[in-house]
Structure formats: C-alpha cells, structure tokens
Interface confidence: medium
C-alpha cells in the first residue's frame, strides 16, 4: 500500500490582478482520515488561506465537492486577485488528532504571481517657475505594478530625452513595485507651449504604454523685453509716449510710469496678444503734458512680472525741442536700459 | 534486521534537563514516523512524540511545552529532551519506529528502553 | 485524545485455556487502526497484530483480533506457557496516539 502523496501539479500560477486563480491539489489517497488545509509560505508564519473543516474564507471556493466521500480533489479559487496575494500556497493534509488536527502531508506548493497593472504615470516639475536656458527636473512616479520589470521612457513634445535617472523600489521581492524617475530638461523661450511626457510601458498593458504629462507652461517664466518710444505729437504741448512689452509669460505684469522718478501711473496687463509661441505682448502709453514741464523729463517705463524684481527702461524727452519736429525717436537714450533679471 | 539501540543519562536531579539518543541500524530512515515512548514503573505505555526524517514533529500536547525531539539524517539517530524534569518523569523510556499509512502508525520496532530516574 | 480502558486489570488462566481480552475506546476507531502488543519482565512491548487483523512477523495464528468502533477483542485460542504477560491494545486512528493500561495475563 503506497502513502499519501499531496499532488500539485502547478509549480508556478501567473494571473492578472482583479481575475480568479486556480491552486490545484489532488491526494493520491483517502487515508489518512483528516482535512486539507491551504497555506501562503511555511514554517510558523504561514497564513491560513483555507480550511476544509472550518472557518469562514469568502474569497475561496473550492473546484470539486469536499463532503463527497471518495473526494481527492482539493483545488481551490481564488477570486479578487490583487498583488498582495502573491506567494507560494501549499495543500497540507492533516490527519486526526486532540486537541487539533496534526499536519500530515503537504505539496511542493504553486507560486503565485499577480500581474498587476501600473498605475497612471504622475510627473511633477519645479515648485517654482524658470526662465529660459535653465536646467529644470520633472519627475515621474507610477506604483502597484507586477512583475518589477518596467520600461520607462522621458519625451518632451515627441522627442525622446536621455537625461534621466530611474529607481524601481523596492530592490527585493516584493508583491508590487513602484517606479521613480527624474528627468532634467533645459527649458527654451519657445517652450510655454511644450509638453513633457513621462511613458511607462509593463507586460499588463499589452503594448498600450500608459502616460503622464506636464505642461512647461506651469514650469516657465519668459521675462518681457522692454522698448519705450516716443510717438509724433498729438496736440500742441504733448507727446505720446509707448512702453511695448513683448515676449513674456505668464501674464501676471504690472507696469508703472515714472515721470523723473515719480510715480505717474500704474497698470495691469489686460488686454494682450498672445504670440503664436504662447507668450504674450502688451502696450502702455503715456501722454505726457510738454507745457507743464520746464526741463527735460525722464520717462521710465517700470515693469514687475510674475512676481520678479521689476525691470525698466527709460526714454529722455527734451522740452527745448519743439515737440512737432520729433518723430518716432526709437533710438531714444535709455539711462536705464540695462534690463535686471533675477533667476 | 532493524535495530534501535537508544542512550543517555539514567539519574537526574529535579529541573534537570533529560536527554536521551536512539540509533536506527539495519534499515531504512526515511519513510518511517520515529517515536519516544515512556513507561512509568508498574503503569502502561505513554507515546510522547515523533519525528519524520523530514523533521516534522507532533508531541502529545500533555508534554509540549517541555519535549523536543530532534533528528540527525546522517547518523541515522534522533533525540529526545524533556526540560524541567520531575518525579513524576521517572520512567523506563523507549525509542521505536512507527509503521503505517493511516498518517498514524502502530510500532513494529523498539529500542531496548533505558529506566531514567529523577531524584533530589 | 481517545481513551482506552482495557478489561479486566488481571487474567487468571491456565495453559490450554482460551483467553479474550477487552479493549475499548471512548469514541469511534477505525477497526485498521488498533494494535495489540505484549510485553514481558524487563523486556520492549511486542508488536502482535495491527490493521485489518494482521498479524506481526513470527506471531503464531492462536493470537486473533476481533471488533469494532468502540470495542475489541484479543483472543489467544490455546494458551502457552510464553504468553503469559501484560497486553496493551494501542489506537494510531487520531493524534495523540494512547494505549491502554493493559491486561496481565497470569498463570492461575
């Protein structure tokens, strides 16, 4: 008479997360007397998945009946996989013991694996804005995938990057993983229409990489460029001067005109352009009253972007001169030209 | 023919630690359940637990908390320890093979038993 | 744990006679699964018959099991003068494995 043997055919299940699986287990004999008991591992820790004596298991069914009486069948489903689930499960047959059933007979155990999906790449820039030729990280974040091989891929509008650094966590065995990613792109003025994508390509999405963007709109600041130029007359004692902002973003500005040094008026940017790049332009003009000034006047055209140090630009209007004889004077001295901008 | 041959301290003090080795001549390890057996002066027979050659052990639950029974596969031996030892643990103590496919077994071979007496 | 009272404590025969020895469990055995065995003075117990009646290596055929669920029986048919001892019946049907406390047989 040959003993008990504890059968399991699978040595290793692959199914996908949310799907049922399937642990087979046949015994080779009706005896001992005793239940099968299922188990994730070995050794003390183990976790008890089914008992065919007792207990309550909701997740588990089993494939053939147990209470009939020349059953050899203990296979078993799992539904609901998710990746914690994985691990090695063992058939034991226990035989009859007092106070508790004594472990008899276990199976060389089914590995299982969980392939799960990973989940929707996030990628995050700077916290704060940058200004064009400046080097910026993005970083790009994806978890609860299964198995740990992974492909990640960094494009910014459709071109591949190659400055990136990836991590998948953990390094060991694990039921699920995460990967980590950060990717440094140089930004260009052209930039405010830009894309960075962040792809991530696993066995579970079945050539239909997944993926995440960020726009550079929310990652750059392109600094205005100041011009002040001086219009041909519109009355008698007065000159039309223009303070042209172009090429900036965001459009957060404020412009204030200073008249020899005092503060002549200020205004937001409302009504702009939008260039074809994304960034913006805007005018200002100031009527200056020639009659009421004695000696020459220095205009300044002050303008705070986004929250930046202010940058200005200044155009000297000679009262001596008769107003209808100056024309559009673009080369005007700026005694203030030298634009400030503070990364 | 199989033989057992067991060895081991045969007088103890009260809390001492018994010991005793069972050697398996003249047939196969593996495949057998091997078993301590204990028998008190004038009494019957008490089984006190097995061992597989795989290591897996089951010990009467009314000395678990102070039995370890061991197994050595390349000397074809196994041991028995019972801590915290007593008067009460002064018995004739016998090694045997345990035969059978139930997943429990009757005994078809027996050491020649070593009388282990705990005294003050 | 299943308990094994075996009857009566002490047998009084004579060789020749037949003697029938109780065993009984307080709850249900698989009838494959008692044994019997003898144990003599200063001596191992003996394996006599385990199973379906089967009986051990050199055991003569006088020595024969009978019974089931909570009772047994061993009978030895013709008593000689070497089988009187101490008999034990053993179950191996549930964990812990128990005995009984034995019957002597004696020469009366």
């Known amino acids: 008479e040959e003993e008990l043997q504890v059968i399991q055919p699978d040595k290793s299940v692959l199914v996908a997360a949310g799907e049922t699986a399937t642990l087979r287990c046949t015994a080779t004999s009706l005896i001992p007397v005793g239940p099968i008991q299922w188990f994730r591992g070995a050794g003390p820790g183990r976790e008890l998945i089914y008992n065919q004596k007792e207990g309550h298991f909701p997740r588990v069914t089993t494939v053939s009946d147990l209470t009939k009486r020349n059953n050899m069948d203990f296979s078993i489903r799992i539904g609901n996989i998710t990746p914690a689930d994985a691990g090695t499960y063992y058939c034991v047959k226990f035989r009859k013991g007092s106070p508790d059933d004594v472990e008899f007979k276990s199976g060389a155990g089914t590995e299982l694996s969980v392939r799960a999906k990973p989940s929707a790449p996030v990628v995050s820039g700077p916290a704060a804005r940058a200004t064009p030729q400046h080097t910026v990280s993005f970083t790009c974040e994806s978890h609860g995938f299964s198995p740990r091989d992974i492909t990640l891929k960094w494009f910014k509008n459709g071109n591949e990057l190659s400055d990136f650094q990836t991590n998948v966590d953990p390094v060991g065995e694990s039921v699920s993983y995460s990967i980590h990613s950060t990717a440094k792109v140089v930004l260009t003025r052209e930039d405010v229409h830009s894309q960075v994508i962040c792809e991530v390509a696993h066995v579970t999405l079945q050539g239909d990489p997944l993926r995440g963007t960020a726009n550079l709109s929310e990652t750059i600041r392109v600094p205005p460029t100041l011009e002040v130029t001086q219009q041909p007359v519109r009355a008698e004692n007065q000159v039309n001067v223009t303070c042209q902002v172009r090429k900036f973003y965001p459009q957060r500005l404020q412009l204030t005109w200073l008249e020899n040094g005092n503060v002549s008026r200020t205004e937001t940017a409302s009504t702009v352009t939008e260039n074809k790049d994304g960034t913006y332009n805007w005018m200002s003009w100031l009527l200056v009253n020639v009659s009421a000034h004695r000696d020459d006047v220095k205009l300044t055209c002050q303008v705070e972007h986004d929250g930046q140090p202010a940058v200005s630009k200044s155009h000297d209007l000679k009262v001596s001169a008769h107003p209808k004889e100056q024309g559009s004077n673009t080369a005007a001295e700026n005694t203030g030209s030298n634009e400030r901008n503070i990364y | 023919q199989v033989q057992l041959q067991q060895w081991g301290a045969g007088l103890l003090k009260p809390s001492e630690t018994l010991s005793l080795t069972c050697a398996v001549y003249g047939g196969s390890f593996s495949g057998y359940y091997w078993s301590w057996i204990r028998q008190p002066p004038g009494k019957g027979l008490d089984w006190i637990g097995e061992?597989?050659?795989?290591?897996?052990?089951n010990y009467n639950p009314s000395l678990k908390r102070r039995v370890t029974i061991s197994i050595d596969t390349s000397k074809n031996q196994f041991s028995l320890k019972l801590t915290s030892v007593t008067a009460a643990d002064t018995a004739v103590y016998y090694c045997?093979?345990?035969?059978?496919?139930?997943?429990?077994?009757?005994?078809?071979?027996w050491g020649q038993g070593t009388l282990v007496t705990v005294s003050s | 744990e299943i308990v094994l009272t075996q009857s009566p404590g002490t047998l009084s025969l004579s060789p020749g006679e037949r003697a029938t020895l109780s065993c009984r469990a307080s709850?249900?055995?698989?009838?494959?699964?008692l044994a019997w065995y003898q144990q003599k003075p200063g001596q191992a117990p003996r394996l006599l018959i385990y199973?379906?009646?089967s009986r051990a290596t050199g055991i003569p055929d006088r020595f024969s099991r009978s019974g089931s669920g909570t009772d047994f029986t061993l009978t030895i048919s013709r008593l000689e003068p070497e089988d009187f001892a101490v008999y034990y019946c053993q179950q191996y049907d549930s964990s812990p494995l128990t005995f009984g406390g034995g019957t002597k047989v004696e020469i009366k």
């Open positions: 199973g379906a009646s």
């Open positions: 061992i597989n050659h795989s290591g897996s052990t």
């Open positions: 709850q249900s055995v698989s009838s494959s699964y």
């Open positions: 045997a093979r345990g035969r059978g496919y139930s997943g429990y077994y009757y005994f078809d071979y």
